[in-house]
């Protein structure tokens, strides 16, 4: 069976991708250089390990997490890697240009690589809502637009609210979730009869998705502490994330069983809910003063994600007309908000305890930042969605959603693949 991937796209995609890569190489040649001030070899290794954790999370964790569609597992893993590789390159340049005025040479440090990996990870989270419905050319556009939008959001927030440019990555869960949902909302919706089969989750892909969830689970403390400089805050972030994740696993497995009429555990619910605690504490992990608070947050997050896993896909389908978004993705949007609300509450408590009269102002700033993040996510997501609907991308026909055969060469096509 020959590929149904339009020939025009198959011809121009490699050329376009290589041209884009050549352009990036030129930009790196003219505008970047390596950091001169980092020296100590032990420190280099310690810093690199954090970056390595992020890469494992992005490539393996998010790659396998989205591989739970029976006929779309190859594309999920490989397209994720492609987006990560492209996103990291563009993010390093963009962060370098946006974080310094006037723009000079971009200094590449281990920190800037971590920062870029996290920016690229936001694209991978968003892509969870559209993987299977778009081709590689469309994903390239999505990477470039979303990384640019996230960078712009951070620059706008740092200028308006006078905060550190790096700090604004704390909105990246919420940004990624709402960006992805908006893009998915713009894509062609109705699925013809007969293609439901492609969307069915089979045992093996669900196991690989669980493997992805495990990678994310193991390394989530790294993502929540990766950018923090203060040793105390970094320690708090790691410990709090660890405890929140631990509790959300217990909640996920027991809650999944509780939600089923026959008290059976759903793998689909579990592999998304086990990560709930990590997302929920992401924004405020450096602020949480005690493990019990992180654990309570993990519990609440686990319950929300089990509830969300049952209701959100139906809600997204019926109300918003968004079909077949991954459960994990729909949960990100809820838990990201929970995390932001927790941050604001903790900020209030901190300022009350320390007798600071600036509570109202701090809360107002935080709400303003969050609102701006959601607004920019929705507008840039809408723009991207409209852009991806253009005919030039030769998007896969709805009948070919979630189908690896459209994109991949198979050595021998086994019946029932």
């Amino acid at each position: 069976m020959s590929s149904k991937y339009p020939r025009s796209v198959r011809r121009c995609l490699p050329l376009c991708a290589l041209t884009l890569e050549a352009a990036l190489i030129l930009l790196f040649y003219f505008f970047t250089h390596y950091d001169a001030s980092l020296e100590d070899q032990k420190g280099l290794v310690a810093s690199y390990q954090v970056g390595q954790d992020l890469t494992v999370m992005a490539a393996l964790g998010l790659g396998f997490l989205t591989s739970n569609f029976r006929r779309h597992s190859w594309s999920s893993v490989a397209f994720n890697l492609f987006m990560l590789a492209l996103g990291v390159q563009w993010a390093i340049l963009l962060d370098g240009f946006l974080s310094q005025f006037p723009p000079g040479k971009v200094v590449i440090t281990l920190f800037s690589i971590r920062l870029a990996t996290m920016s690229a990870m936001s694209v991978l989270i968003s892509a969870g809502a559209v993987l299977g419905k778009v081709n590689l050319a469309q994903l390239v556009v999505m990477v470039l637009v979303e990384v640019t939008a996230l960078g712009t959001l951070r620059m706008v927030i740092s200028n308006i609210f006078n905060t550190d440019y790096h700090m604004n990555l704390r909105h990246f869960y919420v940004f990624a979730a709402y960006f992805g949902l908006t893009v998915a909302w713009c894509l062609p919706k109705p699925l013809p009869k007969g293609t439901e089969d492609n969307d069915q989750r089979a045992t093996i892909p669900s196991l690989s998705a669980m493997l992805g969830a495990l990678f994310l689970w193991m390394f989530w403390p790294s993502v929540n502490s990766a950018l923090l400089r203060s040793p105390i805050q970094r320690k708090n972030a790691m410990f709090n994330t660890y405890y929140a994740l631990a509790v959300s696993v217990v909640t996920a497995i027991s809650g999944s069983s509780l939600a089923h009429p026959q008290r059976k555990i759903s793998m689909t619910y579990v592999h998304s809910a086990v990560l709930a605690g990590g997302v929920a504490v992401g924004t405020s992990c450096h602020l949480i003063p005690s493990p019990w608070l992180a654990m309570v947050l993990g519990l609440v997050a686990g319950l929300i994600s089990i509830g969300g896993a049952k209701c959100l896909p139906v809600c997204c389908n019926r109300v918003l007309g968004i079909h077949h978004i991954s459960v994990m993705h729909s949960i990100f949007s809820l838990l990201g908000l929970l995390g932001e609300i927790t941050y604001i509450v903790l900020l209030v408590l901190h300022t009350v305890w320390n007798g600071n009269g600036m509570i109202g102002f701090q809360v107002l700033l935080s709400i303003g930042e969050l609102s701006l993040a959601i607004v920019i996510a929705l507008t840039s997501g809408l723009l991207t969605g409209l852009l991806l609907n253009l005919k030039i991308w030769k998007a896969p026909h709805v009948a070919k959603y979630f189908d690896d055969q459209v994109f991949w060469k198979f050595p021998h096509l086994a019946v029932g693949f």
Partner: antibody, heavy 128, light 107 residues
Framework: EVQLLESGPGLLKPSETLSLTCAVS????????WSWIRQSPGKGLEWIGE????????YYNPSLKSRVAISKDTSKNRLSLKLTSVTAADTAVYYC?????????????????????WGHGLAVTVSS | AAELTQSPSSLSASVGDRVTITCQAS??????LAWYQQKPGKAPKLLIY???SLQSGVPSRFSGSGSGTDFTLTISSLQSEDFATYYC?????????FGQGTKVEIK
């Protein structure tokens, strides 16, 4: 109250290695970043470098990078500075200092809150 | 590296005067700037961090402002104990850099 006390030789000959230690009391070094700064006679302040108290990350002033090494001993709660091949230009008062932090405001990358606690300083003279 | 230029390099003022010292960065440093006071034979003392936040224990007559490249330290009513040298320091990138200092003398 946090206290920092620098110690080491006050007089060195050119080409020798300067070795200073900074004993910290009142705060575990693993919870903070720590800096070394020097001030030449009648001159301004010059940042030498800094170390993360919890991992081994160090940043140095590029003008001194080839000659300087900052290290820490968590068990003894103290910091060290080594400066090789000293010349008369290295004559200065050497300070160690702690970087402040604010629990409400996270810091990232190189950003920080200034040096909130300083040692009294140690005068070092390089002369033949 | 961001270079810091302080002005004036020295100034004479009387007790009760309002004194303003400026610090200009060669590139944008957001709000990552600290101000220090140093008296002869003593270690510097942190007055202001993050451009405008007053360090605990520092009198409220000291205030800081600015963002990006232009920063100001203001002493609203100069006291006798405020005669010293003042330094700004950027905390945006490595290497950290200090301004050359502003000496505040008695008129």
């Amino acid at each position: 109250e946090v206290q920092l006390l620098e110690s080491g030789p006050g007089l060195l000959k050119p080409s020798e290695t300067l070795s200073l230690t900074c004993a910290v009391s009142g705060a575990p070094i693993s919870n903070y970043w720590w800096s070394w700064i020097r001030q030449s006679p009648g001159k301004g302040l010059e940042w030498i470098g800094e170390i993360d108290g919890s991992i081994y990350t160090t940043y140095y002033n590029p003008s001194l990078k080839s000659r300087v090494a900052i290290s820490k001993d968590t068990s003894k709660n103290r910091l060290s500075l080594k400066l090789t091949s000293v010349t008369a230009a290295d004559t200065a008062v050497y300070y160690c200092a702690r970087e402040g932090q604010n629990p409400l405001v996270p810091t990232y990358g190189s950003t920080g809150f200034g040096l909130d606690f300083w040692g009294h300083g140690l005068a070092v003279t390089v002369s033949s | 590296a961001a270079e810091l230029t302080q002005s004036p390099s020295s100034l004479s003022a009387s007790v009760g005067d309002r004194v303003t010292i400026t610090c200009q960065a060669s590139q944008g440093i957001s709000s990552w700037l600290a101000w220090y006071q140093q008296k002869p034979g003593k270690a510097p003392k942190l007055l202001i961090y993050k451009a405008s936040s007053l360090q605990s224990g520092v009198p409220s007559r000291f205030s800081g402002s600015g963002s990006g490249t232009d920063f100001t330290l203001t002493i609203s009513s100069l006291q006798s104990e405020d005669f010293a040298t003042y330094y700004c320091q950027q905390y945006s990138s490595s290497p950290r850099t200090f301004g050359q200092g502003t000496k505040v003398e008695i008129k």
